[in-house]
């Protein structure tokens, strides 16, 4: 057995889940209900996080670890440890101050969170558009016409989407 904390220090030997009670000769006392200490040698226990409202409990609080929250359906976590819940939008939308708005032409969002991003510019890589972009999907780039050998069958272009994407030339 190798010591990790000093025996002569009345508080450092208190294990996780307890606190060093200065009012009672610095004995190690268990954390009161709805509080925790995740490390040894603590002088106080921290109050457990409560997952209320739009937050829901993912992991209950214990004497040695805090509760963990996530978000109710229709919302998603933001920030370290899910410090905020943000409203979901549909794919092809982004959240603005006025609520969920469709992605502008030339942008897409394939998730229920985050912002609309521009379609990939295939020509920057010397490629052509194989599949047009939509509000929900990025364009798919294919080989440039020069990559196709003579006599090779060319790709039949897809039917235009509701808002067909194009690669600026």
């Amino acid at each position: 057995f190798e010591r990790t904390r000093s025996l002569q220090d009345p508080c450092s030997n208190c294990p996780a889940g307890t606190f060093c009670d200065n009012n009672r000769n610095q004995i190690c006392s268990p954390c009161p209900p709805n509080s925790f200490s995740s490390a040894g040698g603590q002088r106080t226990c921290d109050i457990c996080r409560q997952c209320k409202g739009v937050f829901r409990t993912r992991k209950e609080c214990s004497s040695t670890s805090n509760a963990e929250c996530d978000c109710t359906p229709g919302f998603h976590c933001l920030g370290a440890g899910c410090s905020m819940c943000e409203q979901d939008c549909k794919q092809g939308q982004e959240l603005t101050k006025k609520g969920c708005k469709d992605c502008c032409f030339g942008t897409f969002n394939d998730q229920k969170r985050g912002i609309c991003r521009p379609w990939t510019n295939c020509s920057l890589d010397g490629k052509s558009v194989l599949v047009n972009g939509t509000k929900e999907r990025d364009v798919v780039c294919g080989p440039s016409p020069a990559d196709l050998s003579p006599g090779a069958s060319s790709v039949t272009p897809p039917a235009p989407a509701r808002e067909p994407g194009h690669s600026p030339q």
């Epitope: 010591r3 000093s6 025996l7 002569q8 220090d9 009672r24 004995i27 190690c28 006392s29």
Partner: antibody, heavy 109, light 113 residues
Framework: VKESEGGLFKPTDTLTLACTVS????????ITWVRQAPGNGLEWIGV???????VYASWAKSRSTITRNTNLNTVTLKMTSLTAADTATYFC??????WGPGTLVTVSS | AAVLTQTPSPVSVTVGGTVTINCQAS????????LAWFQQKPGQPPKQLIY???TLASGVSSRFKGSGSGTQFTLTISGVQCDDAATYYC?????????????FGGGTEVVVK
Amino acid sequence: VKESEGGLFKPTDTLTLACTVSGFSLSYNAITWVRQAPGNGLEWIGVINYDGTTVYASWAKSRSTITRNTNLNTVTLKMTSLTAADTATYFCARNFNIWGPGTLVTVSS
Amino acid sequence: AAVLTQTPSPVSVTVGGTVTINCQASQSVDNNNYLAWFQQKPGQPPKQLIYSASTLASGVSSRFKGSGSGTQFTLTISGVQCDDAATYYCLGEFSASSGDWNAFGGGTEVVVK
């Protein structure tokens, strides 16, 4: 923190001392045993940690055992093969900051 | 096993004076500061004064001061009072590999005149 009564023992006897604690739980607090021969200094015997692990002084390891009963709030020191050199006041302490009054153990034929 | 040597013993001091007690370890204490000081009066259990070399234990007068690290440690009592007459012990904590986890010094008797 209080030690049980010591008393007179014969050489080769086995010593059993109990340390009873109140106001705190042994599940979270370490109890250490220390002894002091008459007119001499303090000598560390061993400790039982809050998790039940034990550590002993090298001289005590072969003939000492420290156990605990967390329900009864007692820690027991058992020392075998007593000799006159084991005559001492035996103390138990929570870590080293709360001490019992001590109990005198005399080993004599 | 580690050995703690205390000097001087005994030591005499007048009321209001200052006394210094030294404790030297044969090897470094754990964390370089796992050393405590205790006061013991006849017929009583020891009382912890200092832990972690320099931290004053709860309820102990600030006249007691601990210092040092590694193998050399000092307890200084300033403004000595009659009630300070006692034997003082240092206690070192060592790594388990040293053979003994805890070891006391031999004690220093302080006589107050």
